[in-house]
Amino acid sequence: SEVEYRAEVGQNAYLPCFYTPAAPGNLVPVCWGKGACPVFECGNVVLRTDERDVNYWTSRYWLNGDFRKGDVSLTIENVTLADSGIYCCRIQIPGIMNDEKFNLKLVIKPAKVTPAPTRQRDFTAAFPRMLTTRGHGPAETQTLGSLPDINLTQISTLANELRDSRLANDLRDSGATIRIG
């Protein structure tokens, strides 16, 4: 079964996927596609990297992390209900049938209509329903709470800060990370 991630309409969704390059700059081709991972590559490719760079992308889909260090997590900008579904992250490790593939399920919820809260910089308050499990199993659900009073730039900043915080560590420990070499 796919690991499930959640976001609300209008937010940016974050789908984690990591690998550890065998050596700095020794990159592995990666593709992201809408739909479960097929037999080869990705179906409905939305973003692709090669051994050097991102070589294909479509609007609203980007890598916010440092893909040169193996953070190939996908950000989907300003999601709509149509963005719901399964996404494939495929890490095309060189060799004979070495691919690693991850199916991640994105659930988009309608935006909540709530009174504008007091601005919060505290991560727990800003992201009230973000759940991650530590240690053993995968992060079953990642939910970005509604942020009616924070603009996209602030969301992006928070996401960047989060990525450098405990969440990134939890996700890297969640089984969606592979080590090469």
Epitope: G35, A36, V39, F40, G43, E51, I96
Partner: antibody, heavy 117, light 107 residues
């Protein structure tokens, strides 16, 4: 014109070797996964092998693993299949095929490989 | 390996008839199902990809449907050039596998 053209087939004895080639034209060869699919006389289609666009990742059917090697030369727009330790059951028409949108969307005309003593 | 079972193995029909060929996968393959047409002595030709998407240049009388394990190829009004063998193929799980084929003959 977008096309694939196989060559290299022929008659070979059991245990022998053969190298098939597939020349691609009319598209950006290095951007596509490529495959070999075979068809024994009067039989159905059987996937044999595939290779990623860069050539770094390769895939084989169990029936040929360890005997066949797929490779490509993107500078020459050419796909190869090196076939060693050939058996009678490898007798077939071998097609090269482009893989796109999760399907084999472009096929060559095929080259016949006959393994017989 | 996923087993693809086509039915019927052969059928006879007349020009202008509508025909349906079915393909069943031994396990869920989402919509990763393709249909090919092959004429004697020729290479296969892609007709339908992703269960229902018509390949460029293929006449609209060909259509595909289904998801999960059960799929169909429909030819709405047979033309003389449609008499051939048809194969389904799954692209969900390794290795890719084909059905055994359905031979469509003129009645």
């Amino acid at each position: 014109e977008v096309q694939l053209l196989e060559s290299g087939g022929g008659l070979v004895q059991p245990g022998g070797s053969l190298r098939l080639s597939c020349a691609a034209s009319g598209f950006t060869f290095s951007s596509y996964y490529m495959s070999w699919v075979r068809q024994a006389p009067g039989k159905g289609l059987e996937w044999v092998s595939a290779i990623s666009g860069s050539g770094g990742s390769t895939y084989y059917a169990d029936s040929v693993k360890g005997r066949f090697t797929i490779s490509r030369d993107n500078s020459k727009n050419t796909l190869y299949l090196q076939m060693n330790s050939l058996r009678a059951e490898d007798t077939a028409v071998y097609y090269c095929a482009r893989y796109a949108r999760t399907a084999f969307d472009l096929w060559g005309q095929g080259t016949l490989v006959t393994v017989s003593s | 390996d996923i087993v693809m079972t086509q039915s019927p193995s052969s059928l006879s029909a007349s020009v202008g008839d509508g025909v349906t060929i079915t393909c069943q996968a031994s396990q869920d393959i989402y919509n990763y199902l393709n249909w090919y047409q092959q004429k004697p002595g020729k290479a296969p030709k892609l007709l339908i990809y992703a269960a229902s998407s018509l390949q460029s240049g293929v006449p609209s009388r060909f259509s595909g449907s289904g998801s999960g394990t059960d799929f169909t190829l429909t030819i709405s009004s047979l033309q003389p050039e449609d008499f051939a063998t048809y194969y389904c193929q799954q692209a969900n799980s390794f290795p890719p596998t084909f059905g055994q084929g359905t031979k469509l003959e003129i009645k």
